[in-house]
């Protein structure tokens, strides 16, 4: 194997910090997993930097990421998913930083979609409801959700739900009446695989009845 | 339709060079890594070099290091393979390949050049 | 770096007939091989990657299999046009390697 490197562009390469973060999606695409990486300091100089995972792999021992504007990825099918990748920061040949990194450790759920909340009145209570892409996947199946919703006047006072299921009941006594609420949800791996909260989905917004004076019920929507 | 046309072959002198091009259509070139391949009359494949899909990183066997060099300009659409210090053994057919998979270095062929030949002899 | 040797040299076979080609490697190259067919005159052309999966337009009675470090390619129902020169190649690690290839004739 054999790269290059002007000595100057090694020299100033070993004043910069390369520390970088890297998460993984599987089956993000199919049956394709993703491996993205990123430097921590967005200042770094990537002109010639390249990464390159070599180990647990299948058919080769080393990949190349693409390089996306400030992101290096990975699309493939060929993680073996057992045992540790060395992920390096290469300059040509020279190996400027490695971490040794289980890739089932790393994982980055995709975020939940069709988040929606329907009013019951009789049962004066929301059903919160949202899917999720992993139900139909072959790993990380299992999830924790994380549901955060909050009147829209209360700029950072969220109130979080953690929950196992895509399904979630808000009472409407706990909520004030003829308010405008925003909620959202988020996912990370709950059980073998480990990993990072995903994106939020997009939000929802919805809004609570008003109290009926005579009955002291909330008006529905 | 992808196409792989090399040019630059012909009769070299012991210890001279030659400069080959392969000039690509029908596909982005700066998606993929490429890859020399040469074949002497006669016998059977040997990879000569590899130069990753953003040209910063160049693979060659022992057969070839500091001898032959690769290189490639995206934007004219050619992969290029300088040869010094040529010897005699190094007379062959040259294909320009293009792995079938892009970006990542999974080096196996699906498009070939027609070839070129080189012939090292005084 | 990884050493390829492939088995028969030559073969001679009848046309209907059923060859298999085999192509054994120093070390597991974990499926990191591909088989290619050339006939005379002609540039090489991919046949099978990733040891058993058949590139797009090759014809059904070719396949590849194997794992670890034992590899084959196998021919059902010998045709006319099968007559070539046939490689393995290891794409596991540098150096890319060839098998020394097997000259496949109709008898």
């Known amino acids: 194997e054999s790269g290059y490197a002007q000595n100057g562009d090694l020299e100033d390469a070993e004043l910069d910090d390369y520390s970088f973060s890297c998460y993984s999606q599987l089956e993000v695409n199919g049956s394709q997993h993703s491996l993205t990486c990123a430097f921590e300091d967005p200042d770094v100089n990537i002109t010639n930097l390249e990464f390159e995972i070599c180990g647990a792999l299948v058919e080769v021992k080393c990949l190349n990421f693409r390089k996306l504007q400030e992101i290096y990825f990975i699309e493939t099918k060929k993680f073996l998913l057992i045992g540790k990748s060395n992920i390096c920061v290469k300059v040509g040949e020279k190996s400027l930083t490695c971490k040794k990194i289980d890739l089932t450790t790393i994982v980055k759920p995709e975020a939940p979609f069709d988040l929606s909340v329907v009013y019951r009145e009789g049962a004066n209570d929301f059903v919160v409801t949202f899917n999720t892409s992993h139900l139909q996947k072959k790993y990380v199946k299992v999830l924790m959700h994380d549901v955060a919703y909050r009147q829209e006047k209360d700029e950072n006072k969220w109130t979080h739900v953690n929950l196992s299921s895509t399904k979630l009941t808000l009472l409407q006594r706990k909520l004030q009446p003829a308010a405008m609420y925003e909620i959202k949800v988020r996912s990370i791996p709950d059980h073998y695989f480990k990993g990072f909260w995903s994106e939020w989905s997009p939000s929802y917004y919805f809004r609570t009845p008003e109290i009926n004076n005579s009955s002291g019920e909330m008006d529905p929507i | 339709a992808v196409q792989l046309v090399e040019s630059g072959g012909g009769l070299v002198q012991p210890g001279g060079s030659l400069k080959l091009s392969c000039a690509v259509s029908g596909f982005t070139l700066s998606d993929y890594y490429m890859a020399w391949v040469r074949q002497a009359p006669k016998k059977g494949l040997e990879w000569v070099a590899t130069?990753?899909?953003?040209?910063?990183?160049?693979y060659y066997p022992d057969s070839v290091k500091g001898r032959f060099t690769i290189s490639r300009d995206d934007a004219k659409r050619s992969l290029f393979l300088q040869m010094t210090s040529l010897k005699s053994e190094d007379t062959a057919t040259y294909y320009c390949?293009?792995?079938?998979?892009?970006?990542?270095?999974?080096?196996?062929?699906?498009?070939w050049g027609q070839g070129v030949m080189v012939t090292v002899s005084s | 770096d990884i050493q390829m040797t492939q088995s028969p040299a030559s073969l001679s076979a009848s046309l209907g007939e059923t060859v298999t080609i085999e192509c054994r490697t120093s070390e597991d190259i974990y499926n990191g091989l591909a088989w290619y067919q050339q006939k005379p005159g002609k540039s090489p052309q991919l046949l099978v990657y990733s040891a058993n999966s058949l590139h797009i337009g090759v014809p059904s009675r070719f396949s590849g299999s194997g794992s670890g470090t034992q590899y084959s390619l196998k021919i059902n129902s010998l045709q006319f046009e099968d007559v070539a020169s046939y490689f393995c190649q290891q794409y596991y690690d540098y150096p890319l390697a060839f098998g020394s290839g097997t000259k496949l004739e109709i008898k």
């Open positions: 390949a293009r792995p079938m998979s892009a970006h990542y270095g999974f080096n196996y062929f699906d498009y």
């Open positions: 130069i990753s899909a953003s040209g910063l990183r160049t």
